[in-house]
């Protein structure tokens, strides 16, 4: 604006005029400064002084004036005719994890200088754990008991329990924080009263290659003693990557007679020894019908009597599934419990924990190992984790 | 016990079309892929088709593809197959087969009975 | 995409004999094969799935065996009523491609 008045005068921003001082003046002078997200591009200093002409001048560069670019070390796009250059981002996340978000990960930059998202305004997105995706999926095996090494980190959701009375269990990585194992796994060697307050500092827990992991809480299933599942809440957020990944969750019943899963453990071997290394079977769901026979004589409520072959009677119920011992002699052993029955979606290529091992004890003695039904107790393990 | 019935087979002269139907009932349809697989007279199985059970992902045979269109309709257990630009080695039996898990593309464990495709002038 | 080889192409053998059919991937597929029978006017009918999981009522003289590349059908006693043609198809990923058929006759 050509206000008519001397440089000298008021200047048009509306700053007072600096005070004199005894045998000294006020030069003039200019620092340009580049907006959020950008940076000055300049052999100078960026500091400018007015001289005899009214020139603005610096002292390397004379009157070449600074530019401001991204602050990200990219070139400043080029202009084109009739258009201009929206100032945008876009959020991805490191390996191992997705973006969750209801947008589609790209911020525009508003007047108000606000990254801003069409979809989701400035709520910013998050980093979430990839589940249910190894990147050496098991191989498949015809033959926990025979069982086959799990050389290749094909169950990177398994993670091993330790009880004080160094007892091994199974537990299940369901995301950075949290596992799923059998409320049985949580009581061991504790009597039947003891609180969850009791049970956590007295566990061991490692993940990946064995790798300690601090337990914050336990959450034992309201009905634990039909639904044998608990909760366990980590004190930090593990790190997601090749050798530790959660399992996801299912929205479907994969719990379907004659499908195939594969059930990790370091419980007991062939040998009744606890295994140093993690071993994995493939098992075919079974009738429940058939496995209610097995177990308790008849499905006909009346006439049920136990006659499991191991001596202990496993919970079969409508929250349970059973998975058979093939005709190749491998099962689940003591220890095993806790462990996710993974089944693979092929049409998403992802794995699944359709069920919990709760009974380990068929050690191919018995003809089925039962399973929780991960899909009973999705809205519990849910709400849980929300209030938590 | 699972059924899956094909219907709108016929005689077609090469160039025309032609719409397949297969109603399913007695399992949740929109949990399964869906397929098609055509036989030629005294030949073997050909896969044609898939459908996806989650979103609406569809797969071709490079013999069909741009000019056969599968979809389904879940709220009615169907399953289509609209046929065009008809050929006379289009000349087959039709089948709709259910795949046998959830998740899974294949391994079918129900046929429907089959629609028998003519394709002459 | 991926090629289904099926061999051999028919077999004659007497009951009682061991038959084996053999199907060959051009890539691996781990253990994503399934069998088929096909009577002579009948619809296919699962026998095998996951290479070697038995599907529910098939009698136990049929086999599968076989991961990544080479599979296997096995009838340890051909009886007459196997007389059929049986077919191979990968069930990974689509294309799920068959295999040729391999037709079975009695001596």
């Known amino acids: 604006v050509d206000s008519g008045n001397d440089v000298t005068d008021i200047a048009d921003d509306g700053c007072p005029k600096p005070p004199e001082i005894a045998h000294g003046y006020v030069e003039h002078s200019v620092r340009y400064q580049c907006k959020n997200y950008y940076k000055l591009r300049t052999e100078g200093d960026g500091v400018y002084t007015l001289n005899d002409k009214k020139q603005w001048i610096n002292k390397a560069v004379g009157d070449k004036l600074p530019e401001c670019e991204a602050d990200d070390g990219c070139p400043k796009p080029p202009e084109i005719a009739h258009g201009y250059v929206e100032h945008s981002v876009r959020y991805q996340c490191k390996n191992y994890y997705k973006l969750r978000t209801e947008g589609d990960g790209v911020y525009t930059l508003n007047n108000e200088k606000q990254w801003i998202n069409k979809a989701v305004g400035d709520k910013l997105p998050e980093c979430e754990a990839v589940c249910g995706k190894p990147k050496n999926p098991a191989n498949p095996v015809q033959r926990i008991l025979g069982g086959h090494l799990d050389a290749k980190g094909s169950f990177p959701w398994q993670a091993k329990m330790v009880s004080h009375h160094n007892l091994t269990t199974g537990a299940t990585l369901i995301n950075e924080q949290w596992l799923l194992t059998t409320a049985k796994n949580l009581f061991l060697n504790h009597s039947e009263n003891a609180t969850a307050k009791d049970i956590a500092p007295t566990l061991t827990l490692y993940v990946g290659k064995k790798q300690l992991v601090e337990i914050e809480k336990v959450v034992l299933h309201p009905n634990y003693s039909q639904v044998d599942i608990g909760l366990i809440k980590l004190k930090q957020k593990v790190s997601v990557n090749e050798r530790v990944m959660p399992i996801c969750l299912p929205s479907k019943d994969y719990a379907e007679v004659g499908r195939v899963g594969y059930v990790s453990g370091w419980g007991r071997n062939a040998n009744f020894k606890f295994t140093d290394h993690l071993k994995y079977v493939m098992l075919p769901v079974a009738d429940q019908d058939q496995c209610i026979r097995h177990y308790e004589g008849s499905t006909v409520p009346e006439k049920k009597t136990p006659k499991s072959p191991v001596g202990v009677q496993p919970i079969l119920n409508e929250h349970t599934f059973c998975a058979g011992m093939s005709k190749y002699q491998e099962d689940t052993c003591y220890g095993d419990a806790g462990s996710a029955f993974a089944v693979h979606d092929l049409e998403e290529d992802t794995w699944y924990a359709t069920g919990i091992l709760s009974f380990d004890k068929s050690c191919a003695v018995a003809e089925y190992g039962v399973y929780v039904k991960v899909t009973s107790i999705q809205d519990w393990v849910q709400k849980t984790i929300a209030e938590n | 016990e699972v059924q899956l019935l094909e219907s709108g087979g016929g005689l077609v002269q090469p160039g025309g079309s032609l719409k397949l139907s297969c109603v399913a009932s007695?399992?949740?349809?929109?949990?399964?892929?869906m397929s098609w697989v055509r036989q030629a007279p005294g030949k073997g199985l050909e896969w044609v088709s898939t459908?996806?059970?989650?979103?609406?992902?569809?797969f071709y045979a490079d013999s069909v593809r741009g000019r056969f269109t599968i979809s389904r309709d879940n709220s009615n257990n169907m399953l289509f197959l609209q046929i065009d630009s008809l050929r006379a080695e289009d000349t087959a039996v039709y089948y709709c087969?259910?795949?046998?898990?959830?998740?899974?593309?294949?391994?079918?464990?129900?046929w429907g009975q089959g629609a028998l495709v003519t394709v002459s002038s | 995409d991926i090629q289904m080889t099926q061999s051999p192409s028919s077999l004659s053998a007497s009951v009682g004999d061991r038959v084996a059919i053999t199907c060959r991937a051009s890539?691996?597929?781990?253990?994503?094969l399934a069998w088929y029978q096909q009577k002579p006017g009948k619809v296919p009918k699962l026998l095998i799935y996951?290479?070697?999981i038995l599907q529910s009522g098939v009698p136990s003289r049929f086999s599968g065996s076989g991961s990544g590349t080479d599979f296997t059908l096995t009838i340890s006693s051909l009886q007459p009523e196997d007389v059929a043609t049986y077919y191979c198809?990968?069930?990974?990923?689509?294309?799920?491609?068959f295999g040729g058929g391999t037709k079975v006759e009695i001596k």
């Open positions: 087969a259910k795949a046998q898990f959830v998740g899974h593309w294949a391994q079918y464990n129900y």
């Open positions: 007695e399992f949740t349809f929109s949990n399964y892929a």
């Open positions: 459908f996806s059970s989650g979103g609406s992902r569809t």
């Open positions: 890539q691996g597929i781990r253990n994503y």
């Open positions: 996951d290479a070697f």
């Open positions: 198809q990968k069930s990974d990923s689509p294309p799920l491609t």
